[in-house]
């Protein structure tokens, strides 16, 4: 049976490669995938022309993180 | 919205079987993460598994590998199947999506409860 | 797999007053990217968890102002600042840092005093 990827187990993973633009960072396979095989947006390059996320926000939540946090520039650094 | 209902719990003996279904609407199982939690009477939540948006899963390892996650992409349903239960599986099997980008359960079904008895 | 450590198991508490549940984790919960994936989830009887604070300090949509998150590493706090009877629940601390399996703390119930 097949059993998904490993645990990281406390060892430090490689901060994650950027992203090409029409991919983002899968942080549970720990790669760049396709970004509409995710559910939720990430947020978008600035001047990015690349196509927006398939799924919509959920109600009333933005996509960003909370007070204070700033959005990262690529999605690959999620 | 998204909305998951889950459906087929029930009564079964030790050593028995149940499959129970989690039905997903407004949103897609072929994408993200789709997983079941579990919580034994009077217990804290327990994590039993995924399956991804291509179809790969993962399990809790306490599982030993007496639980398998399925999907029906056509139904949008996903599934868990469980084998040669015990009485400590006994607990109220919750569905739930997975916010992929800050790891978070976002949606939860109502729960369908399980029980484990002769 | 991460260990989450929660206290107190259970707590007796008025309407009015300030509420601190703690959290904590058998190992650091910076993920390598910089994020600590640690979250925090209110769940009342018969019903299933509901989201309330995400990644240490974020109230999630629709979330009360009263309930605030914070800390890092291995050592986390979710403060109530003032309780409300719709406040009474069980509350879970769970980690998506070093994932699979994702853990919840074994969780706090706060009870009328």
């Known amino acids: 049976m097949r059993r998904g990827p490993r645990s990281l187990r406390g060892r430090d993973a490689p901060a994650p490669t950027p992203c090409v633009p029409a991919e983002c960072f899968d942080l549970l396979v720990r790669h760049c995938v396709a970004c509409g095989l995710l559910r939720t947006p990430r947020p978008k390059p600035a001047g990015a022309s690349s196509p927006a996320p398939r799924t919509a926000l959920q109600p009333q939540e933005s996509v960003g993180a909370g007070a204070g946090e700033a959005a990262l520039p690529l999605p690959g650094l999620l | 919205e998204v909305q998951l209902v889950e459906s087929g719990g029930g009564l079964v003996q030790p050593g028995g079987s149940l499959r129970l279904s989690c039905a997903a609407s407004g949103d897609s199982i072929n994408f993200g993460y789709w997983n079941w939690v579990r919580q034994a009477p009077g217990k804290g939540l327990e994590w039993v598994g995924y399956i991804s948006y291509s179809g790969s899963t993962y399990y809790n390892p306490s599982l030993k590998s007496r639980f398998t996650i399925s999907r029906d992409t056509s139904k949008n349903t996903f599934y868990l199947q469980m084998n040669s239960l015990r009485a400590e599986d006994t607990a109220v099997y919750y569905c739930?999506?997975?916010?992929?980008?800050?790891?978070?359960?976002?949606?939860w079904g109502q729960g369908t409860l399980v029980t484990v008895s002769s | 797999d991460i260990q989450m450590t929660q206290s107190p198991s259970s707590l007796s508490a008025s309407v009015g007053d300030r509420v601190t549940i703690t959290c904590r984790s058998s190992?650091?919960?910076?993920?390598?990217?910089?994020?600590?994936?640690l979250h925090w989830y209110q769940q009342k009887p018969g019903k299933a968890p509901k989201l309330l604070i995400y990644?240490?300090?974020n109230r999630f949509s629709g979330v009360p102002s009263r309930f605030s998150g914070s800390g890092s590493g291995t050592d986390f706090t979710l403060t109530i600042s003032s309780l409300q009877p719709e406040d009474f629940a069980t509350y879970y601390c769970?980690?998506?840092?070093?994932?699979?399996?994702?853990?919840f703390g074994q969780g706090t119930k706060v009870e009328i005093k």
């Open positions: 769970s980690q998506s840092t070093h994932v699979p399996p994702f853990t």
């Open positions: 190992q650091s919960l910076v993920h390598s990217n910089g994020n600590t994936y």
């Open positions: 990644k240490v300090s």
């Open positions: 739930a999506a997975l916010n992929d980008l800050f790891l978070y359960f976002d949606v």
